[in-house]
Amino acid sequence: AILGRSETQECLFFNANWERDRTNQTGVEPCYGDKDKRRHCFATWKNISGSIEIVKQGCWLDDINCYDRTDCIEKKDSPEVYFCCCEGNMCNEKFSYFPEMEVTQPTSNPVTPKPP
């Protein structure tokens, strides 16, 4: 491990379409990948009229957009589907939306999936 870097070995797993995809709905996902690559966690969600609906959470492959990010934060302004990634075990348990373009006070929506 490189000093100061959070190695990601497992992430929170959630799949809203678990029945269609034939997966578990929730759990812990071990992260696999080429040994020369970094690994991350991600979360995707939708904001339906102010209500947060998690789409998926899990492991994410080597991506410079995620390097050295200990928190999972979406910065894109009003995306259709929100996405964030981070480094460190289970770092996708909580996620937030802080749009970079926003002039008004940004709001944070830390969310953990409710058990089925």
Epitope: T44, G58, C59, L61, D62, I64, N65, P79, E80, V81
Partner: antibody
Framework: QVQLVQSGAEVKKPGSSVKVSCKAS????????INWVRQAPGQGLEWMGT????????SYAQKFQGRVTITADTSTSTAYMELSSLRSEDTAVYYC????????WGQGTLVTVSS | QSALTQPRSVSGSPGQSVTISCTGT?????????VNWYQQHPGKAPKPMIY???RRPSGVPDRFSGSKSGNTASLTISGLQAEDEADYYC???????????FGGGTKLTVL
């Protein structure tokens, strides 16, 4: 092992559209991006665009903006690249590649645009 | 995004070393360690040789190395072998907020 298998060669008329598929296996499809790259005969590589396979978010090269659409079907682990208003200069081999680092590539799909 | 600049061709004898350059701007090559190098043999898909400026994928011989100085990235191949004769392309990471761009390609001839 990671594999990206693309659809077969296509011959198209100018003005028409083509849709090339890229079926992924050997890894979790929703854990990365799929990029699309093309290579005209005897020419270099040209980046067309990318899709985040889990969120569906896309980015396109300015040159192809408005003419290319990249989609992903997570239920079949397949990405698609559709190019419209084809012209002869679009004759090329079209590749899909996994992730932002383009670490695995499809075998390529030759699209020939000819009247 | 304009294409990265590579020499059209380079050559070397077996056992020698060659270096291929890839020049961009402060906003692509110069801004971060996200330059990749690919090897392409005729009629084949490109093969990643170096990513993130200097990281080598498993299976790639350590004769291949990458570096960067300012806005120029370089691929060095030492102990040239006949099978190294191919086209080499530099390119950038593409995904999220990053847009991809490739160099024009360099034809390496092993004399």
């Amino acid at each position: 092992q990671v594999q990206l298998v693309q659809s077969g060669a296509e011959v198209k008329k100018p003005g028409s559209s083509v849709k090339v598929s890229c079926k992924a296996s050997g890894y979790t499809f929703t854990s990365s991006y799929i990029n699309w790259v093309r290579q005209a005969p005897g020419q270099g590589l040209e980046w067309m665009g990318t899709i985040n396979a889990v969120s569906g978010s896309t980015s396109y090269a300015q040159k192809f903006q408005g003419r290319v659409t990249i989609t992903a079907d997570t239920s079949t682990s397949t990405a698609y690249m559709e190019l419209s208003s084809l012209r002869s200069e679009d004759t090329a081999v079209y590749y899909c590649a996994r992730g932002g680092w383009f670490d695995y590539w499809g075998q390529g799909t030759l699209v020939t645009v000819s009247s | 995004q304009s294409a990265l600049t590579q020499p059209r061709s380079v050559s070397g004898s077996p056992g020698q070393s060659v270096t291929i350059s890839c020049t961009g701007t402060s906003s692509d090559v110069g801004s971060a360690n996200y330059v990749n190098w690919y090897q392409q043999h005729p009629g084949k898909a490109p093969k990643p040789m170096i990513y993130g400026v200097s990281r080598r994928p498993s299976g790639v011989p350590d004769r291949f190395s990458g570096s960067k100085s300012g806005n120029t990235a370089s691929l060095t191949i030492s102990g040239l072998q006949a099978e190294d004769e191919a086209d080499y392309y530099c390119g950038t990471f593409a995904g999220g907020k990053y847009y991809g761009v490739f160099g024009g390609g360099t034809k390496l001839t092993v004399l």
